[in-house]
């Protein structure tokens, strides 16, 4: 990995959990300042493999909301509109980063955690031909 | 939004910075145990608007390596394999938090913060009609 | 932030051509497409080709299919623009872009231009 030149001016890191825990300031930065994340809302609709998001809430992550992709066919939308099930409607997925309250319902303590979330759909051609 | 009972035994939230800095436990919980995340890693190719996927490495970013997908066609690709330019290929966007070290080049100091991936591309019906 | 910097304009004759050029820096992991555009006096940017940088593939508005041709240098961060069989009507300030959503990208999103380079075509 790359060594990074460690800063002077560090917080103590005496702790006996260290490097385990470490202090996180919640303040968010909000790095999309030359983009609109709002700009693939209508994509969900316009897509040859349309999809709807369902809203995950759980008051012990953050963010506590999540919002996922389901997509809506089998198939995929083609030009007249109809579902064409020669190709495949499938789900792309990331590994995200949340945090956890852990012990549970502390409001300044937190674990790492990794999920798996569906950002949208795509059309695929299929690999699997077992259906008539 | 949601009130939390407290946990009698979280730590203590004296701090003056308290609650804009929290204590995180970088020991990674999975929660993908019924899941493949490698499963989607072909869509890329087989979808009718495939991408590539690029390294973006920043070792002040934990994660350090985030992948960013770049759709490889301003049009998707038709039955016969070629670019159909009466659709667009487009990048599904998601908003990720990451940590960033603050002050910088700090082991265990960090700060949130909200990037924009590009996860994958779809195919979706033009708005915008400039082309010929 | 992404630094564009345009050049090759200049002051050509009906039926001439001219090459243009467009030096990107600091462009985002996830950039697919790149485009240029013109704004002739009074009237509104508009859209004149694009070209995605993995696939190589172009799309041109209408008023410059057959006289124009876009290309990119993937490895100079560089998209040209060549302009053959010139027309009074292409005079014009000429500007490059990243396209964020390729041909989806509307003229309104685009927060950052270059300078440009003004295209003269004479009768």
């Known amino acids: 990995g790359i060594t990074i030149p460690r800063n002077p001016g560090c917080p103590n890191s005496e702790d006996k959990n260290f490097p385990r825990t470490v202090m996180v300031n919640l303040n968010i930065h909000n790095r999309n300042t030359n983009t609109n994340p709002k700009r693939s809302s209508d994509y969900y609709n316009r897509s040859t493999s349309p999809w709807n998001l369902h809203r995950n809430e759980d008051p012990e992550r953050y963010p506590s909301v999540i919002w996922e992709a389901k997509c809506r066919h089998l198939g995929c939308i083609n030009a007249d509109g109809n579902v064409d099930y020669h190709m495949n409607s499938v789900p792309i997925q990331q590994e995200i980063l949340v945090l956890r309250r852990e012990p549970p319902h502390c409001p300044n303590s937190f674990r790492l955690e990794k999920i798996l979330v569906s950002v949208g759909c795509t059309c695929v051609t299929p690999i699997v031909h077992h259906v008539a | 939004g949601i009130t939390i009972p407290r946990n009698p035994g979280c730590p203590n939230s004296e701090d003056k910075n308290f609650p804009r800095t929290v204590m995180v436990n970088l020991n990674i919980h999975n929660r993908n145990t019924n899941t493949n995340p490698k499963r989607s890693s072909d869509y890329y190719n087989r979808s009718t608007s495939p991408w590539n996927l690029h390294r973006n490495e920043d070792p002040e970013r934990y994660p350090s390596v985030i992948w960013e997908a770049k759709c490889r066609h301003l049009g998707c690709i038709n039955a016969d394999g070629n670019v159909d330019y009466h659709m667009n290929s487009v990048p599904i966007q998601q908003e990720i938090l990451v940590l960033r070290r603050e002050p910088p080049h700090c082991p265990n100091s960090f700060r949130l913060e909200k990037i924009l991936v590009s996860v994958g591309c779809t195919c979706v019906t033009p708005i915008v009609h400039h082309v010929a | 932030q992404v630094q564009l910097v345009e050049s090759g304009g200049g002051l050509v004759q009906v039926g001439g051509s001219l090459r243009l050029s467009c030096e990107v820096s600091g462009l985002p992991v996830s950039s697919y497409a790149m485009g240029w555009f013109r704004q002739a006096p009074e009237k509104e940017r508009e859209f004149v080709a694009a070209i995605s940088w993995i696939g190589g593939d172009s799309r041109y508005a209408h008023f410059v299919k057959g006289r124009f041709t876009i290309s990119r240098d993937n490895a100079k961060n560089t998209v040209h623009l060549q302009m053959d069989s010139l027309k009074p009507e292409d005079t014009a300030v000429y500007y490059c872009?990243?396209?964020?959503?390729?041909?989806?990208?509307?003229?309104?999103?685009?927060?950052?231009w270059g300078q440009g380079t003004q295209v003269t075509v004479s009768s």
């Open positions: 872009n990243d396209m964020p959503y390729g041909l989806d990208t509307r003229m309104d999103e685009y927060e950052y």
